[in-house]
C-alpha cells in the first residue's frame, strides 16, 4: 500500500493505476481527468479590491470606483456589519474588531461616511462632514503577536514561541521550504517551491514546532500561484496554500499579519529572517533547529548595482541582509518570512532568490508582499 501510494496514482472509472509522475503533467491520463485536478493552480491578479488598511493605525480606506480616488472611512455611523463587510472584501472570514481613532492634522485623504451596497463598502451619497472627527481603525484578524520577543543578535537558534507562524512545507516528508501562517486556512510561501512537484497530494505542512521532524503534518487542499510573467521571470514568486482543515491557534501556532498597503520600509530598517535552511552555501545540510537572524533593508539601487544584481531586482522585490555580508537566507529557507515589527509582526517579504548565501554585495532577494495584497485578497475572496 505504501509503495503503491508512493509511486502510483489510482484513477477511478475504470479503476486503474498510473505512474505518479504523470500527475499534473498537463495530460489527461485518467479518463475523468482527476490526475490533473489536484495540482498547483494559477490565479490571475484580478480586479482592484476596493478597501485597504493603512499603516496609520490600521485605518480603513475605501475606493471610489467612479473617480479612482481613495477616501478614509469616517467613524460616524460605522457598525459591526460594515466592519465585517470590509474584512470579507479582503477575503477574511474571522470576526473583526474596530475602534475610533482621532483624525490628525496631517490627514491627507478626504474623509467620508461609509455605507454598504451589494456586500461592498461604498461612500454614502450626500453625507455630511465627519462629525466625530474620527477614523475607523480596523483589524480583520488578531495576528502578529508572539509569546517571546527575539534578542537582536546575528544568528542564533530560534524558539517557536518567538515565531508561532513559521511552518515547514514538506514533500514526501522532506522539508522543502518555509512558510507563514496567515489565517486558520492559509499559509504563505514562495511559488518556486512547487516547480518540481506540482501535485498537491504529497505536500504537507508542519506547524507548531522549531524542530524539523517533531510535529504532526497537515493536509493541503489547494496550492495557488500567480500566472507566470515571461517578461519578469523572477517576479510573482508567491504562493498560497489552503489547508484541508483550519488550524487551531495556540501559543505555538498563530498567524502573522500581512503588511499594510503603504508599508514602505526605508534602507537600514531592522528585519528578521528565520528558517531551517542550509547553514553553508553549496553544502552542509538542513538545520534541524529553526534559526533566526536580524538583517536590514538594503536599498534597491545598491542591490541593483553592477557588482550586485545588475537591475534584476524589480519593484515587486526587496533586498535584505547586512552590509558586510555573512547573514542571509539560504537553500531550504525559501518561502519563509522576512519580518518587520511595529505593534505587531508583519510578513513584508518572502524568501525568494539570491546569488550564493551571505555574500556582501549579493544580499537575499525577497518577494515584496505589499505588492501582492490585491492578489492575496482576490484568492481568499474566491475561496470564501
Amino acid at each position: 500500500k505504501v509503495i503503491l501510494d508512493k509511486y502510483y496514482f489510482l484513477c477511478g472509472q475504470p479503476l486503474h493505476f498510473i505512474p505518479r509522475k504523470q500527475l499534473c503533467d498537463g495530460e489527461l491520463d485518467c479518463p475523468l481527468g482527476e490526475d490533473e485536478e489536484h495540482c498547483v493552480k494559477s490565479f490571475p491578479e484580478g480586479p482592484a479590491v476596493a478597501v485597504r488598511l493603512s499603516k496609520d493605525r490600521s485605518t480603513l480606506q475605501v475606493l471610489d470606483s467612479a473617480t479612482g480616488n481613495w477616501f478614509s472611512a469616517c467613524f460616524d455611523n460605522f457598525t459591526e456589519a460594515l466592519a465585517e463587510t470590509a474584512c470579507r472584501q479582503m477575503g477574511y472570514s474571522s470576526k473583526p474588531t474596530f475602534r475610533a481613532v482621532e483624525i490628525g492634522p496631517d490627514q491627507d485623504l478626504d474623509v467620508v461616511e461609509i455605507t454598504e451596497n451589494s456586500q461592498e463598502l461604498r461612500m454614502r451619497n450626500s453625507s455630511g462632514p465627519c462629525l466625530s472627527g474620527s477614523l475607523v481603525s480596523l483589524h480583520c484578524l488578531a495576528c502578529g503577536k508572539s509569546l517571546k520577543t527575539p534578542r537582536v543578535v546575528g544568528v542564533e537558534e530560534a524558539s517557536v514561541d518567538s515565531w508561532p507562524w513559521q511552518v515547514s512545507i514538506q514533500y514526501d516528508k522532506q522539508h522543502v521550504c518555509g512558510g507563514s501562517i496567515l489565517d486558520p486556512h492559509w499559509v504563505l510561501t514562495a511559488a518556486h517551491c512547487f516547480r518540481k512537484h506540482t501535485d498537491v497530494f504529497n505536500w504537507k505542512v508542519r506547524a507548531g514546532s522549531d524542530k524539523l521532524g517533531s510535529f504532526p503534518s497537515l493536509a493541503v487542499a489547494k496550492i495557488i500561484i500567480i500566472e507566470f510573467n515571461p517578461m519578469y521571470p523572477k517576479d510573482n514568486d508567491i504562493a498560497l496554500m489552503k489547508l484541508q482543515f483550519p488550524l487551531t491557534f495556540s501559543g505555538t501556532v498563530r498567524p502573522i499579519c500581512l503588511p499594510f498597503f503603504d508599508e514602505e520600509l526605508t534602507p537600514a530598517t531592522p528585519l528578521w529572517i528565520i528558517g531551517w535552511g542550509f547553514t553553508k552555501q553549496n553544502g552542509g545540510k538542513m538545520s534541524d533547529i529553526l534559526l533566526q537572524a536580524s538583517v536590514q533593508v538594503i536599498d534597491s539601487t545598491r542591490c541593483n548595482a553592477d557588482d550586485a544584481y545588475q537591475g534584476e531586482v524589480t519593484e515587486k522585490m526587496m533586498c535584505a541582509g547586512i552590509p558586510e555580508g555573512g547573514v542571509d537566507t539560504c537553500q531550504g529557507d525559501s518561502g519563509g518570512p522576512l519580518m518587520y515589527q511595529s505593534d505587531q509582526w508583519h510578513v513584508v517579504g518572502i524568501v525568494s532568490w539570491g546569488y550564493g548565501c551571505g555574500g556582501p554585495s549579493t544580499p537575499g532577494v525577497y518577494t515584496k508582499v505589499s505588492a501582492y495584497l490585491n492578489w492575496i485578497y482576490n484568492v481568499w475572496k474566491a475561496e470564501l
Epitope: 492634522p105 453625507s127 462632514p129
Partner: antibody, heavy 121, light 107 residues
C-alpha cells in the same frame, strides 16, 4: 473643479444688514464645513464662524455673536452670511472658504473671490 | 482664544534669498498649523498644512517646521512671484485665529 462664487460688492448704511452669498460647485456640497473670514482694508484675516451645510449647524466667533447668521440652501448649494447692525468698522472683504477635507479641524483650502462690503453714511 | 504672533511684520529680500518667517502660538497647538500666501486683491492661498505638509501644486521651495508653540515658514530661494503677504493660522481650537501677517517686499 471646486469653485466658490460670491455675490457682488455692497454699500450699506450704518445700522443696516447685509447678506452675502457663496455658491459652491464641483464637489459634494454637504460634505464640507464652510468658514467665513473677513479682511478690513490693509488689515489681517479675521475668522467669523463656520456652518455645516449638511445639518445647518453653526458656530460663531464671540465677537460676532448676536449680529451674524449663517444659513445654507442645499437645493442650490449656496451658503449665506448675514451681518446686522452694521458699523463703519465692518467695512471689509468677506470670504467664504471650504475646508481641505471633510473634517472641522482641517484648514480652509478653497476660497471665494471675496465680497467687498462698504459701510458708509 | 489662542493668539498667533508672527514676526517679522515685514521684510525686504532679493530674488534667490532664503527667507524665514516665524509664528508663535500663545499655547500649544500640536501641529494644527497652516500657512497662507496672499497677493493684493486676491484670496489667500493655502501653502502648507499640518505644520510641514506641502499642499498639492505648491512649489517645493516652500517648507514648514516646528511643533507645539513655535513654527517656521521657509522659502529656500525667493522667486519674483513669492513677493506677497504670508499668514499663519491655527485650527487646534475654535475660534480659528490668524497671525498678523508678514509682508515680503523686494529689496
Amino acid at each position: 473643479q471646486v469653485q466658490l462664487v460670491q455675490s457682488g460688492a455692497e454699500v450699506k448704511k450704518p445700522g443696516a444688514s447685509v447678506k452675502v452669498s457663496c455658491k459652491a460647485s464641483g464637489y459634494t456640497f454637504t460634505g464640507y464645513y464652510m468658514h467665513w473670514v473677513r479682511q478690513a482694508p490693509g488689515q489681517g484675516l479675521e475668522w467669523m464662524g463656520w456652518i455645516n451645510p449638511n445639518s445647518g449647524g453653526t458656530h460663531y466667533a464671540q465677537k460676532f455673536q448676536g449680529r451674524v447668521t449663517m444659513t445654507r440652501d442645499t437645493s442650490t448649494s449656496t451658503v449665506y452670511m448675514e451681518l446686522s447692525s452694521l458699523r463703519s468698522e465692518d467695512t471689509a472683504v468677506y470670504y467664504c472658504a471650504r475646508v481641505r477635507i471633510g473634517w472641522l479641524q482641517s484648514p480652509p483650502l478653497y476660497w471665494g473671490q471675496g465680497t467687498l462690503v462698504t459701510v458708509s453714511s | 482664544d489662542i493668539q498667533m504672533t508672527q514676526s517679522p511684520s515685514s521684510l525686504s529680500a532679493s530674488v534667490g534669498d532664503r527667507v524665514t518667517i516665524t509664528c508663535r502660538a500663545s499655547q500649544g497647538i500640536s501641529n494644527y498649523l497652516a500657512w497662507y500666501q496672499q497677493k493684493p486683491g486676491k484670496a489667500p492661498k493655502l501653502l502648507i498644512y499640518a505644520t510641514s505638509r506641502l499642499q498639492s501644486g505648491v512649489p517645493s521651495r516652500f517648507s514648514g517646521s516646528g511643533s507645539g508653540t513655535d513654527f517656521t515658514l521657509t522659502i529656500s530661494s525667493l522667486q519674483p512671484e513669492d513677493f506677497a503677504t504670508y499668514y499663519c493660522q491655527q485650527s487646534y481650537k475654535t475660534p480659528l485665529t490668524f497671525g498678523g501677517g508678514t509682508k515680503v517686499e523686494i529689496k
